[in-house]
């Protein structure tokens, strides 16, 4: 019926304003509605003014489409010619009463069809139902993913892709890891990838300053080490390095009054010459203390070397050992006097003896023939050395003696000549003060070792070498090496060592067999004023510890591992330092710093005396030790 | 969307190197595993290789030593070279997007290799 | 590899009749992910092959649902419930389950009696 009602109207429209004109009233006949007359009536004026004869205006342009008056009165009423609608938006144009409807195609909207519709932006469609990235198009949209993933089938979810199955051999010698969107070249720890070579490369840590002191690399890690000899220990964070502290303050008070006779190791304390009237005799008055049992107290000699007298110590008794062109003697008599006492001691030429007294009390007489040394011109000259020799006189000697003497002498007067000027030379030299109060032992000072060529084969045990110690310690200072057994090739096959312990206040013993720890004693207080005592064993087999406390050990496999490195070191030559390490590199042991404080050692049932050291450092003392800080109210 | 373009001599000379190009238009290089088909004359299809966008690479067994795929991310494209060729690489040759279902999703027209002297 | 063995080599089928196309594989096509990756393919008379079904039985976009996949582990099949013109042509399946190794099947060729 529609169809009929446009037909009619084309019919009337044709007859009324295209065979003839129309007015705007006859118009509204063909139409028979104001809306779309007045939208038809301008529009058909202007298709008149264009294609009257010989009349080309402006508004011809906007009739160009029409080749004539028809063609254009005709398409007025069309609302979708020309198309009103945005060409790549519309479906389809319907035409109304002056006006026009576009249908849009999906992907678009707007009355002309000529606006997109983000699908992206969809709120009851979130991200256009993209699993990771949504691309809006114009009319349209597409979903895409993030490198690393793939498009499924769907066209909107996207799967992570594994690399590491794709390429198998991908990262080389690394292990291929696949993460979401991408993959990694994992390394163990301490190495870094080489995205070149596709293998894994140690990591230089030492190149990266990461110590605070020393740093030695190793393939997938590095160690820091701090210069415990200097009296650095590495802190907590296994980094940097803090100072090896004092866990049991000593006194360490000295006085310029007393001589210390120890000051070298080797060597002569004070030498002193007297030339005196040759009616004089020789005479040494002193006070006398030391635990030591053997040692020179002072040697005398003539000029010419040709007689001499030696006031010495052993067997913790006072020896006498003269001789001269008269006679050759030797005497040994008195009490015990290494007892850390204070003893007056005094020896006197008489005209036919030499006495000898403690506190003042005669305790040997030694008759001679004749004075002891002989004048020259008139003068008696005679040099007097403390505490050794002045020269190799062991040949000389009537019974050879270990010269080394760890002792103090005070209120002394030498030939009846008072102190005569030596207490201002030693006033001057800290190193020959000695310590006001002393106790028996031997005390490191942490500055410094002994060395010892111990032999450790028996022959009558079949396990071969075996080592039997005993340490009896009071530490001053929670870090330092006590014993160490140090190979020629500068390896150390076997230490025991003082750490610090985590926990505070207290310290590890921690036993190693060159930088490998293979028994731990944790946590023990020694820092106090008992000594604490340890005990072990050790031969091929075994490490056993006879002193019942808290172990933590490797395993029996690694245990053995590193035994056999001990075994095999014992067969060589090994030198033992007490105290401390010689120079070996830092990464030899786990432990460098020296030991500070008191410590008395027995190895396979001998009691190391010092003195007998093949070197010792000049500061540790053999036989005195100084006597913990005791606080008093005001200090 | 996502459309493939292959490109290359039609006709290549025995012994000679085919060499094909796939332009990918429409999305991302790195959504899919790029892969070479051919289809000889009234034949069925063989897999020829693929490629994945950081350059992972897998041919076919019966191929492999005579063929490379690679990949030019920045001109969105892939390639395809055939060495030392035979009447017997004469083919219709496709590229075609393997999704992450592992099916072929996406196909390139074709186009026609003859090899002939 | 994988081999993929289709039956029949042709298939002559009456319009609005339905068709079957077997694929057998030479081993279990599930994957250690537990997906079998197993795909169909139409290639019309001039035209480059296209996407049917993947993964056994999931329809891909714009395919006629008169398009089915079942099958499990080695035998699978493709069917076309009533079968139109515009279907005829080779159907290949494929098997991506060895995946980067893809192998297809000879092909089986849909046409009208």
């Known amino acids: 019926a529609n169809s009929m009602l446009e037909e009619t109207k084309q019919g009337n429209l044709e007859r009324e304003c295209i065979e003839e004109l129309c007015n705007k009233e006859e118009a509204r006949e063909v139409f028979e509605n104001d809306p779309e007359t007045d939208y038809f009536y301008p529009k058909y004026l202007v298709c008149l003014r264009s294609f009257q004869s010989g009349l080309f205006t402006a508004a011809r342009q906007s009739t160009d489409a029409y080749p004539d008056l028809r063609s254009c009165v005709n398409a007025i009423p069309d609302q979708c010619s020309p198309l009103p609608c945005n060409e790549d938006g519309y479906m389809s144009c319907k035409d109304g009463k002056a006006s026009f409807t576009c249908t849009c195609k999906p992907g678009w909207q707007g009355e002309k069809c000529e606006f997109d519709i983000n699908e992206c932006k969809d709120p009851s469609n979130i991200n256009g139902g993209c699993s990771q990235i949504c691309d809006n198009t114009p009319g349209s949209y597409h979903c895409s993913c993030k490198s690393g993933f793939v498009m499924l089938s769907n066209k909107k979810d996207c799967k992570d892709v594994d690399e590491c199955s794709l390429k198998p051999n991908m990262c080389g010698t690394a292990v291929c890891k696949n993460i979401p969107g991408d993959f990694e070249c994992e390394c163990p720890e301490g190495y870094r990838y080489n995205l070149k070579s596709k293998s894994c490369e140690d990591v230089d840590e030492c190149s990266e300053n990461m110590c605070a002191q020393l740093c030695v690399n190793y393939p997938g890690g590095y160690t820091c080490y701090c210069d415990g000899k200097k009296g650095f220990k590495l802190a907590q964070d296994q980094k940097s390095c803090e100072a090896v502290s004092v866990c049991l303050p000593l006194n360490l008070d000295t006085k310029y009054e007393l001589l210390y006779l120890a000051e070298q190791f080797a060597g002569v304390v004070l030498y002193l010459k007297f030339r005196l009237p040759e009616i004089s005799r020789f005479s040494a008055e002193f006070d006398f203390r030391t635990y030591d049992s053997q040692g020179v107290i002072l040697y005398a000699e003539s000029i010419d070397h040709s007689a001499w007298l030696l006031i010495a110590l052993r067997g913790g008794k006072i020896e006498v050992q003269l001789k001269n062109e008269h006679t050759s003697k030797i005497t040994t008599g008195g009490d015990i006097i290494n007892n850390g006492l204070w003893n007056m001691v005094s020896v006197e030429e008489l005209e036919h003896s030499i006495s000898i007294k403690i506190a003042k009390e005669a305790v040997m007489d030694i008759n001679k023939p004749g004075p002891l040394f002989k004048p020259e011109n008139g003068l008696l000259e005679t040099k007097v050395y403390f505490a050794g020799f002045p020269r190799k006189v062991e040949s000389e000697l009537i019974k050879p003696i270990n010269p080394r003497l760890d002792g103090c002498i005070r209120s002394w007067n030498l030939m009846k000549q008072g102190a005569s000027g030596i207490k201002e030379i030693i006033q001057e030299k800290q190193n020959k003060h000695c310590l006001v109060t002393v106790e028996k032992g031997s005390y490191y000072p942490g500055s410094g070792i002994a060395e010892f060529h111990i032999d450790y084969n028996n022959g009558s045990n079949a396990e071969g070498w075996h080592i039997n110690v005993t340490l009896n310690i009071r530490p001053s200072m929670g870090t330092g090496v006590m014993l160490a057994l140090v190979s020629s090739n500068n390896t150390v096959p076997f230490a025991v060592s003082l750490v610090d312990s985590t926990s505070e206040k207290s310290q590890d013993i921690v036993i190693s067999v060159e930088n490998t720890v293979i028994y731990r004693i944790q946590a023990l207080s020694l820092c106090s004023n008992q000594r604490s005592h340890l005990e072990f064993r050790v031969n091929r087999n075994n490490l056993e510890l006879l002193t019942p406390l808290k172990i933590e050990t490797i395993s029996q496999e690694e245990l053995q591992t590193q035994l056999a490195i001990l075994d095999k070191a014992m067969k060589g030559k090994v030198a033992t330092y007490l105290g401390g390490l010689p120079d070996v590199p830092f990464s030899a042991t786990p432990v460098n710093a020296f030991y500070n404080g008191c410590m008395e050692v027995n190895i396979n049932g001998v009691e190391l005396d010092l003195d007998e050291a093949i070197s010792k450092h000049n500061d540790i003392r053999a036989h005195s030790c100084p006597s913990v800080w005791k606080k008093t109210k005001n200090s | 969307q996502v459309q493939l373009q292959e490109s290359g001599p039609g006709l290549v000379k025995p012994s000679e190197t085919l060499s094909l190009t796939c332009t990918v238009s429409?999305?991302?290089?790195?959504?899919?595993?790029w892969n070479w088909i051919r289809q000889p004359p009234g034949k069925g299809l063989e897999w020829i290789g693929y490629?994945?966008?950081?350059?992972?690479?897998d041919y076919n067994p019966s191929l492999k030593s005579r063929v490379t795929i690679s990949v030019d991310t920045s001109k969105n494209q892939f390639s395809l070279k055939v060495t030392s060729v035979t009447a017997a690489d004469t083919a219709v040759y496709y590229c075609?997007?393997?999704?992450?279902?592992?099916?072929?999703?996406?196909w390139g027209q074709g186009t026609l290799v003859t090899v002939s002297s | 590899d994988i081999v993929m063995t289709q039956t029949p080599l042709s298939s002559p089928v009456t319009l609005g009749q339905p068709a079957s196309i077997s694929c057998r594989s030479s081993?279990?096509?599930?994957?250690?992910?537990?997906?079998?990756?197993l795909s169909w393919l139409q290639q019309r008379p001039g035209q480059p092959p296209r996407l049917l079904i993947y993964?056994?039985?999931n329809r891909f976009s714009g395919v006629p649902d008169r398009f089915s996949g079942s099958g499990a582990g080695t035998d699978f099949t493709l069917k076309i419930s009533r079968v139109e013109a515009e279907d005829v042509g080779v159907y290949y399946c494929?098997?991506?389950?060895?995946?980067?190794?893809?192998?297809f099947g000879g092909g089986t060729k849909v046409e009208i009696k």
């Open positions: 075609a997007a393997l999704s992450g279902d592992h099916a072929f999703d996406i």
């Open positions: 429409g999305g991302s290089i790195s959504n899919y595993y």
């Open positions: 490629i994945y966008y950081i350059g992972i690479t």
């Open positions: 081993q279990s096509l599930v994957h250690s992910d537990g997906n079998t990756y």
């Open positions: 993964k056994i039985s």
């Open positions: 494929m098997q991506a389950t060895q995946f980067p190794h893809l192998t």
